[in-house]
Interface confidence: medium
């Protein structure tokens, strides 16, 4: 289960994003257009720092389907 | 120096299960992820997996699911891939690779690689 | 077949420019951070270019990388025959079973 105190990297932080992801796929970086401001990728933000689960879920490739 | 050194050469017969070793040294072994690539003769690189040796976290390539297993002996500063149910197309050379995730996703030390034959 | 696309060999004659492409999708290339090796014959491979277009220390600069949508291209300048390898592209897929993915390998001839 994703602990959201703890900090994420390699293979540990792509096993977390398959899990919170699921079949939506997931991105190391944001496609440019869907942020407003450069970032510079899910390293930064949950490897060297920790980070929460809806940040992790802002890496999915494509929304949720709403129920 | 950092390197990374892998097991002898191993012959094995189908069906069989090989383990193949990886002794780290002039870094901290938990601090990195350890991967696991392979190559068939005159073929490309081809990987199999990762493991954390800190937690023992691994995720593997579903192409290998249910035949590989990665472990760990960080008093050791070892890393350990079994490969099971050998078949003549597991003939390759096998290699470990460091991790550093800090690098964004390149592993920059290599071992110098371990060839295992499956012949019967 | 490999996720990733590599010619599957280039040639150059020594002192000339050469460029190495490698194309993916979203799921891999365009979204995540690229990594090159080379793989001199006999040996392992050695990271050459990391995150798209750093090279790690003791690496000249007469390697370069570079991404754009979803390819990325290896530049090799001043071509050597010690650069007379196997090359390889490899990143990230983050489909549905995530893992590392390579470049079928592309082979320089330094003519």
């Known amino acids: 289960a994703y602990r959201p105190s703890e900090t994420l990297c390699g293979g540990e932080l792509v096993d977390t994003l398959q899990f919170v992801c699921g079949d939506r796929g997931f991105y190391f970086s944001r496609p440019a257009s869907r942020v407003s401001r450069r970032s510079r990728g899910i390293v930064e933000e949950c490897c060297f720092r920790s980070c929460d689960l809806a940040l992790l879920e802002t890496y999915c490739a494509t929304p949720a389907k709403s129920e | 120096q950092v390197q990374l050194v892998q097991s002898g050469a191993e012959v094995k017969k189908p069906g069989a299960s090989v383990k193949v070793s990886c002794k780290a040294s002039g870094y901290t072994f938990t601090s990195y992820d350890i991967n696991w690539v392979r190559q068939a003769t005159g073929q490309g690189l081809e990987w199999m997996g990762w493991?954390?040796?800190?937690?023992?976290?691994?995720g593997y390539a579903q192409k290998f699911q249910g035949r590989v297993t990665m472990t760990r002996n960080t008093s050791i500063s070892t890393a350990y891939m079994e490969l099971s149910s050998l078949r003549s197309e597991d003939t390759a050379v096998y290699y470990c690779a460091r991790d550093p995730y800090y690098y964004y996703y390149g592993m920059d030390v290599w071992g110098q690689g371990t060839t295992v034959t499956v012949s019967s | 077949q490999s996720v990733l696309t590599q010619p599957p060999s280039v040639s150059a004659a020594p002192g000339q420019k050469v460029t190495i492409s490698c194309s993916g999708s979203s799921s891999n290339i365009e979204n995540n951070h690229v990594s090159w090796y080379q793989q001199l014959p006999g040996t392992a491979p050695k990271l050459l270019i990391y995150?798209?277009?750093k090279r790690p220390s003791g690496i000249p600069d007469r390697f370069s990388g570079s991404k754009s949508g979803t390819s990325a291209t290896l530049g090799i300048t001043g071509l050597q025959t010690g650069d007379e390898a196997d090359y390889y592209c490899?990143?990230?897929?983050?489909?549905?079973?995530?893992?590392?993915?390579f470049g079928g390998g592309t082979k320089l001839t330094v003519l």
């Open positions: 493991m954390n040796p800190n937690s023992g976290n691994t």
């Open positions: 490899e990143t990230w897929d983050t489909s549905l079973s995530a893992g590392r993915v």
């Open positions: 995150d798209n277009n």
